[in-house]
């Protein structure tokens, strides 16, 4: 099992303890209760663009 704080997921993905792997945050709008989606809320997805400097 992954130790928290090690092998972080790439931007736009989040760790799923249910699947033992990084999962794409893009699926969270369709199914927001997936366990990894909590981690997605903490960081913007890769495609997110800041609207301010």
């Amino acid at each position: 099992e992954r130790v928290p704080g090690t092998t972080p997921c790439s931007r736009g993905s989040s760790w799923s303890a249910d699947l033992d792997k990084c999962m794409d945050c893009a699926s969270c709008p369709a199914r927001p209760h997936s366990d990894f989606c909590l981690g997605c809320a903490a960081a913007p997805p890769a495609s997110f663009r800041l609207l301010w400097p």
């Epitope: 099992e1 249910d18 699947l19 033992d20 999962m23 366990d35």
Partner: antibody
Framework: EVQLLESGGGLVQPGGSLRLSCAAS????????MMWVRQAPGKGLEWVSY????????HYADSVKGRFTISRDNSKNTLYLQMNSLRAEDTAVYYC?????????????WGQGTLVTVSS | DIQMTQSPATLSASVGDRVTITCRAS??????LNWYQQKPGKAPKLLIY???SLQSGVPSRFSGSGSGTDFTLTISSLQPEDFATYYC??????????FGPGTKVEIK
């Protein structure tokens, strides 16, 4: 060829215990989530329990929570279901099934099932 | 919990018929819907996943459609080996997976 072979079913009295096993072969067991699903005689399918690939995360249907424990031994390619405090309503064929490679989405391979009968 | 219903409960059909089975969810489940076939005394077999994707090895006469709350499984030309019970299953609320009650396809 992917194969899942359940064993351990049988007749048990109410309040008794059983441990089911599911031996996996024909694929690399450790990366896959696994599930138990049951089917009472003449009835439909009911999801029972889920375990993550590492075994670190488990989930249970409300009907078995606190009585059943799912576990796995990846070195033996085997899935288990420890069933305690059995009730008549637990009588069913119990199937182990392999989860899909995304988020719990489907069950792509199933065992042949093992019958558990709870009766005095 | 998300409830799944199927209609009809039993369907009588002949070889060669086009058969449609409906599955309805009590709330929107996007496309997180799968279909299984089960023959007496056998384990269920995955036919369709993600509402419309055909599982490897499943004949192309089987197809699935729908999203949200309403889904259909269609068998374009019923074959003798297709007489069985069909179940839908939602995986939207995973791990609280639920199955429909089943539709039995029998010989007319």
């Amino acid at each position: 060829e992917v194969q899942l072979l359940e064993s351990g079913g049988g007749l048990v009295q109410p309040g008794g215990s059983l441990r089911l096993s599911c031996a996996a072969s024909g694929f690399t067991f450790s990366p896959y989530p696994m599930m138990w699903v049951r089917q009472a005689p003449g009835k439909g399918l009911e999801w029972v329990s889920y375990i993550s690939p590492s075994g670190g995360k488990t989930h249970y249907a409300d009907s078995v929570k606190g009585r059943f424990t799912i576990s796995r031994d990846n070195s033996k390619n085997t899935l288990y279901l420890q069933m305690n405090s059995l009730r008549a309503e637990d009588t069913a064929v119990y199937y182990c099934a392999r989860g899909g490679d995304t988020y719990f989405d489907y069950f792509d391979y199933w065992g042949q099932g093992t019958l558990v009968t709870v009766s005095s | 919990d998300i409830q799944m219903t199927q209609s009809p409960a039993t369907l009588s059909a002949s070889v060669g018929d086009r058969v449609t089975i409906t599955c309805r969810a009590s709330q929107s489940i996007s496309s997180y819907l799968n279909w299984y076939q089960q023959k007496p005394g056998k384990a269920p077999k995955l036919l369709i996943y993600a509402a419309s994707s055909l599982q490897s090895g499943v004949p192309s006469r089987f197809s699935g459609s729908g999203s949200g709350t309403d889904f259909t499984l269609t068998i374009s030309s019923l074959q003798p080996e297709d007489f069985a019970t069909y179940y839908c299953q939602q995986s939207y609320s995973s791990p609280g997976i639920t199955f429909g009650p089943g539709t039995k396809v029998e010989i007319k």
